[in-house]
Interface confidence: low
Amino acid sequence: NIDVCKLGTVTVQPAPVIPLGSAANISCSLNPKQGCSHYPSSNELILLKFVNDVLVENLHGKKVHDHTGHSSTFQVTNLSLGMTLFVCKLNCSNSQKKPPVPVCGVEISVGVAPEPPQNISCVQEGENGTVACSWNSGKVTYLKTNYTLQLSGPNNLTCQKQCFSDNRQNCNRLDLGINLSPDLAESRFIVRVTAINDLGNSSSLPHTFTFLDIVIPLPPWDIRINFLNASGSRGTLQWEDEGQVVLNQLRYQPLNSTSWNMVNATNAKGKYDLRDLRPFTEYEFQISSKLHLSGGSWSNWSESLRTRTPEEEPVGILDIWYMKQDIDYDRQQISLFWKSLNPSEARGKILHYQVTLQEVTKKTTLQNTTRHTSWTRVIPRTGAWTASVSAANSKGASAPTHINIVDLCGTGLLAPHQVSAKSENMDNILVTWQPPKKADSAVREYIVEWRALQPGSITKFPPHWLRIPPDNMSALISENIKPYICYEIRVHALSESQGGCSSIRGDSKHKAPVSGPHITAITEKKERLFISWTHIPFPEQRGCILHYRIYWKERDSTAQPELCEIQYRRSQNSHPISSLQPRVTYVLWMTAVTAAGESPQGNEREFCPQGKAN
């Protein structure tokens, strides 16, 4: 803060506002009878320079004129843009202990004259809005600069508004507060912007426009849609618009889409028919308006209308598969499975499925509806059976999909050859095969079916399957494939009335099993030891087990154990070993091996064979 200048005055020449690059002379004068007491000649006037309230320079060496004890003039150069504060102080040199006393101060502003404003743009939002213009001010002036926006038009129409820019606010837009009405549609208006500050002034070029050039219609409102006869694909979009609108742009898309459908509508009068909608789909609709076919600006997009189109009857074909299990000599259980239609095929909420099992020759028909995607029935083992399934929503049902029930693995000649399963990554398995060698009927299609090899998976979980054309010999299976789980994979070759299959196990990722098999019993029969075990719990297998290892060694021996490997069979849980010495106590344990390595050992059991050595 500058004290009120009681001791003296500070003046600036040529002025306190100067152009960039100019010098200024600052004079500091003491008032009469002010200064250091008794010794006027000891008065020393000093000038201090402050930027942003920080002392940056003592201008002692810049004196250009000095009336000792009365006044001093300092020349300041190289001032930076913006405001600089200079404070004159009195230093009484005979009193070293007293600090200099402020005399007076002055602020010098360094800036530039304004450039002519450019790129004037005016808009009026809606027929009842007001005209607002914006412009580019050019380089920052670093000075308070006044801007005047002037509009002139027909019938001696004139109007102006002002604003200013300084270091706290920027002025590059003004609302004139007047409304241009449609009856002036053909009239021409001129605006210009004038900028003035202490260093000069400038004016923009005149900017000419018409009503149509600047009026941006308000976005349409009250948007709604009517679906003709509850159609899921045809609807009439309706909306409200300002009276002068002649052109509309419509855009619409399903909610999960990334690209809009665009439509231009001339003289729509707030109504437009859409014919290509997808049934039972959430859509977003927006509309924009324009007042003139060729000129003018589009309004902002309206608020979105979000709605779902009505249902229509399902289309498409269900993907059906089945399992066949003999119950006894004259009955079999048929389990039908099918995949849900995708939304574009379902075209609504599927309420139920119509399932039919028909014996072709005897014309026996079993029918049922179910809300599930599977259906199980017990039927006679005799006769040729066919199944069909259709999906129904509130508007109707899809065409039934038929499948012949054949013995899926009944024909060895139709069994695919050289089936392999390779892990591709964490989520999928590549299955490849060769066609049947001596098929006596043409392969119509291959079905690759897979199921996790876990207890109860056949009864608890439906199979997963892929239909493969007859000329393809590979499939990448990914649905419900998880790492560290073993799957039984079957490749079926189907002809019109027969089926053959080959099976393999595979996993998408494997680790060594967490634990080894648990030995439950060791029995001696005919000089051989039978080792019985329980399998590793399914989650701890961590992939497909390739084989088991049975280890044995003499109880107190430090030698490496002996071992035998047994190929993994889910149904097998005992195995004989021989060549053990009688009346020697052995320690036995088991491990399991996957493609990733060996499990830790299972429990240890001791056993002392009694029989003769082999």
Epitope: K482, P483, V514, S515, P539, E540, R542, P600
Partner: nanobody
Framework: QVQLQESGGGLVQAGDFLRLSCVFS????????MGWFRQAPGKEREFVAA????????QYAEAVKGRFTISRDNAKSTVYLQMSSLKPEDTAVYYC???????????????????WGQGTQVTVSS
């Protein structure tokens, strides 16, 4: 990418109890077994407790048996460690760990767990 976030640590008196939580994200929680480990200053990370994906099998380090209980809520994708009768020697950073496999046996080394949280500090004052 699996992420684990522990919470619930703090400063307690000896004999008090504390419940740690670990929220799992970025995968299917029900496919993972979960474990708690701890690491005291200057010591190696050591096993505390583990629980199978289904929650039907649990294991504990000898030092915490009878005092700590591990549990899980598959609906909330969260595993808990209820700690009671806390002792000063329980002071450590407690880490939550996850792995698609569940190891049964004494060798619960940290290397058997694939995914780890950042840890939560538990300090037990005497």
């Amino acid at each position: 990418q699996v992420q684990l976030q522990e919470s619930g640590g703090g400063l307690v008196q000896a004999g008090d109890f504390l419940r740690l939580s670990c929220v799992f994200s970025g995968g299917t929680f029900g496919d993972y077994s979960m474990g708690w480990f701890r690491q005291a200053p200057g010591k190696e990370r050591e096993f505390v407790a583990a629980i199978r994906w289904s929650g039907d099998s649990t294991q504990y380090a000898e030092a915490v048996k009878g005092r700590f209980t591990i549990s899980r809520d598959n609906a909330k994708s969260t595993v808990y460690l209820q700690m009671s009768s806390l002792k000063p020697e329980d002071t450590a950073v407690y880490y939550c760990a996850a792995d698609p496999s569940y190891y049964i046996g004494p060798n619960h080394t940290p290397s058997r767990y694939r995914d780890w949280g950042q840890g939560t500090q538990v300090t037990v004052s005497s």
